[in-house]
Structure formats: C-alpha cells, structure tokens
Amino acid sequence: AGHLEQPQISSTKTLSKTARLECVVSGITISATSVYWYRERPGEVIQFLVSISYDGTVRKESGIPSGKFEVDRIPETSTSTLTIHNVEKQDIATYYCALWEV
C-alpha cells in the first residue's frame, strides 16, 4: 500500500512570495497514482484544491483563483509538489496531500 509523507511541518513566507509544499510517495510508483491536494483553513471545512492523475492530467477546483496553485510530480524523487503563488493571508492553512491508487 502507498504511504505519504509531507516532510515540511510548516512553511513561513512573506506576502507575495512563492511557497512550495512537498508530498513524498512511497510503497507505490507515483506514476501509477493520483495525488490530491487539500487545504484546511482555521475554523473551516477541508477543501479540495487540485489533483494530478496517474496520466498527468491536472484538475483544479472551480472557484479557486486562477494561477494561484500549481501541482506537479517528479517521478525521480517520487514527489508531488504544490506551488502556491503570491502568498496572501487567505492562503494561511494546513495543506494535506492524499493518494488514490489506480
């Protein structure tokens, strides 16, 4: 079974900078999985943001600002990255990655 690890416990950025969050997949080939990213703002329900499927297809939640989030995967390091552009107050949250095995 696949296992996920988010090595960064926290990431501190100044306004308008870029944050990159990592999710390391083990126990399964990342190319054979879909990785989903979610965020949980304080006091709010968890929200789906973006996913990258086994074939590389990216799906973004409607209503998420255009260009705010970018998802990628690096098979060599078995890692999925979530890039948050122009960090703002509204981006303060806990971000989770999740796995769906094909």
């Epitope: 306004l15 304080p42 107050k89 509204q90």
Partner: antibody
C-alpha cells in the same frame, strides 16, 4: 500619518456608472487586503467588497455582485471600485478601508484600522 | 450568512456611567474574527477592538471587549463626553460576507 483618500463620487442617474478611487499614502498598499464599505443616509455600515493583497481573492456582497468590480494597482498605491447599473439603493457614502493584516500561522483578523474620509455617491433621476 | 444583532438600539447614559453594548451572532464566530468600531456624525468609523478583546492602537483602556461563540460585549467603563457615538460590531473570516451589526447609539441622558 497613514492615510486613505477616496474620490470619484457624485450624482448619477439610475443605470449609470461611476468609478471610485482610493489613494493610499505613507504605507505600501501591496502589503494589505483592502475593502470598500458603504453607509446609506441615516443607516449603518455595509461591507461591499474586498480584495486580497495580490488580487487573487476578490469578494462581493450579494447586493452588488455582478454590478461592481473591485481592483487595485499596487504600483500606483491605489484601490478602485467600478460601479455599473447603479440603483437608487446604492446611494451612500463609500469608504475604503485597510485590513491591518496577518502574522504567524493563525488566520487572525486585526480589523479595518485605516479608513478614508468617504466619498458620496447619489443615484437619482 | 452570519447575522449580527446589536442591542440595545439606543443607550441613554450620563458621563461617568458604565456602558455595556451587546453583539449577538446568528451562528458561532471565532473570537479572532470579531471587531468593534466607533463612529461619530460626519466621520469615518474608527477601529476600537479586534480579536474580540484586543484594543487597537491609541484606544483608551476604558474600552474593553469580551465574549466568545455567539455573544460578544463592548464595555466602556466610564463614559467620557467624546464617547457618545454609534458603535458597530463586525465579524470577519476567510470567506465573505464580512457583516456589520446594525449599530448601537450611545447618547447623553
């Protein structure tokens, strides 16, 4: 002293348009979320719209959604409110207001700490 | 949408008296997201309290805020002549709308 100065108000006929401006001085606008708040004659405060520091997150009150557009030009240290399809009920004093910002890991609200003096919009035939 | 209801609508008091203003939310509001403002005739509002209980810069210590959940209170311990004004509570979160209460007018008795 940090300051916000609104302009662009005036008398307009129903269905008309106006563009309000808000100029910031002695602080860097790009570091703050900004808001428009209005107050109809003899009434209370009504939040109208907000825009995040990098313009990614934009919100409107239901009463103005689809008619008003908030924007900002951080290079010019200015905030704008484009108002279209104006109605009599849009008559109010319009204030721009600065959201004091955030720090740390908590989404913490510090209030609207700097307000402009207001600009009056009157919609009447 | 969270609705904030302020009471009383008008508070008639004399200088030196204690004023207690109430703000009740239709659903629970994080105390981190509750602010109070003062507005005098012909002037823009002024931030008094943020985070339900923290005084904004330059606000005298006779103003204090308290409460959590759905019930919040602004207290003015001893009214000064310049405190007679309209007071608004406001809730704010990471999603809109960022509503204000309808206001409480503190007038001279």
């Amino acid at each position: 002293e940090v300051q916000l100065v609104e302009s662009g108000g005036g008398l307009v006929k129903p269905g008309g348009s106006l563009r309000l401006s808000c100029a910031a001085s002695r602080f860097t606008l790009s570091s703050y979320d900004m808001n428009w708040v209005r107050q109809a004659p003899g009434k209370g405060l009504e939040w109208v719209s907000s825009i995040s520091s990098s313009s990614s997150y934009i919100y409107y009150a239901d009463s103005v959604k689809g008619r008003f557009t908030i924007s900002r030009d951080n290079a010019k240290n200015s905030l704008y409110l484009q108002m279209n399809s104006l109605r009599a009920e849009d008559t109010a004093v319009y204030y721009c207001a600065r959201d004091r910002g955030v720090g740390g890991t908590d989404y913490y609200y510090y209030g609207l700490d700097v307000w402009g003096q207001g600009t009056t919009v009157t919609v009447s035939s | 949408e969270i609705v904030l209801t302020q009471s009383p609508g008008t508070l008639s008091l004399s200088p030196g008296e204690r004023a207690t203003l109430s703000c009740r939310a239709s659903q629970s509001v994080s105390s981190s997201y509750l602010a109070w403002y003062q507005q005098k005739p012909g002037q823009a509002p002024r931030l008094l309290i943020y985070g339900a209980s923290s005084r904004a810069t330059g606000i005298p210590d006779r103003f204090s805020g308290s409460g959590s959940g759905t019930d919040f209170t602004l207290t003015i311990s001893r009214l000064e002549p310049e405190d007679f004004a309209v007071y608004y509570c406001q809730q704010y979160g990471s999603s809109p709308p960022y509503t204000f209460g309808q206001g409480t007018k503190v007038e001279i008795k």
